[in-house]
């Protein structure tokens, strides 16, 4: 819970309780915005980024954005709060320990984006689909 | 009883430097993360450090980062924050703070301790 001795401030996003009363800590997520990359048709990459930061705010997640248009790759790595859209798409995997890509319709380049919730998760960004639960014969493993 | 005891705050001009330490018993010390976090007057938290169970994997608010080294000593159960070049933002009331974790639902907050970087 709550410390008594922390105070709570009005409006005070930066303390976060799950449903037992503990206060949500930070997760640790890459962040290096925008770089190029070499990561092009493979099953999962890492992220190269060496830069590991402490989330500003408790509820933020990771989030990977890769995209690929005529001229070059990159590969975003942020912090995010899972509340706000990130590039005008929700972040409906957050929960998610993985961060499994997911293909958006941008005009002009191929867009994919992940999020989730476990410490550096998005330094493994996978794109495969045996781990993309989009893929119905999965689905039918998971259901049996 | 879980304790976390804080010392080492007080006044000091900017450019200045403290160090932080933190006491922990009631629990096993050298099996978790542990966190510096600072609350400023009328502010929300912000969360400064963190530091691996075994001291090597250390982690850093951008606000402070180049500053302020975390470190622990597990044989004594006690957590470090060595803060240098200290400005008058850095001013707030330091909480060491062990995360909830895979072993224990619960987080642990020591009472505090004031740092005032003032000329």
């Known amino acids: 819970t709550i410390p008594p001795h922390v105070q709570k401030s009005v409006n005070n996003d930066m303390i976060v309780t799950d449903n037992n009363g503990a206060v949500k800590f930070p997760q640790l997520c890459k962040f290096c915005d925008v770089r190029f990359s070499t990561c092009d048709n493979q099953k999962s990459c890492m992220s190269n980024c060496s830069i590991t930061s402490i989330c500003e705010k408790p509820q933020e997640v990771c989030v990977a954005v890769w995209r690929k248009n005529d001229e070059n790759i990159t590969l975003e790595t942020v912090c995010h709060d899972p509340k706000l859209p990130y590039h005008d798409f929700i972040l409906e995997d957050a929960a998610s320990p993985k961060c499994i890509m997911k293909e958006k319709k941008k005009p002009g380049e191929t867009f994919f984006m992940c999020s989730c919730s476990s410490d550096e998760c998005n330094d493994n960004i996978i794109f495969s689909e045996e781990y993309n639960t989009s893929n119905p014969d999965l689905l039918l493993v998971i259901f049996q | 009883e879980v304790q976390l005891l804080e010392s080492g705050g007080g006044l000091v001009q900017p450019g200045g430097s403290l160090r932080l330490s933190c006491a922990a018993s009631g629990f096993t010390f050298a099996q978790g993360d542990m966190w510096w976090v600072r609350q400023a007057p009328g502010k929300g938290l912000e969360w400064v450090s963190r530091i691996g169970m075994d001291g090597d994997k250390t982690y850093y608010a951008d606000s402070v980062k180049g500053r302020f080294t975390i470190s622990r000593d597990n044989s004594k159960n006690t957590l470090y924050l060595q803060m240098n070049s200290l400005r008058a933002e850095d001013t707030a009331v330091y909480y060491c703070?062990?995360?909830?974790?895979?072993?224990?639902?619960?987080?642990?907050w020591g009472q505090g301790t004031l740092v005032t970087v003032s000329s």
């Open positions: 703070a062990k995360g909830p974790s895979s072993t224990s639902p619960f987080d642990y």
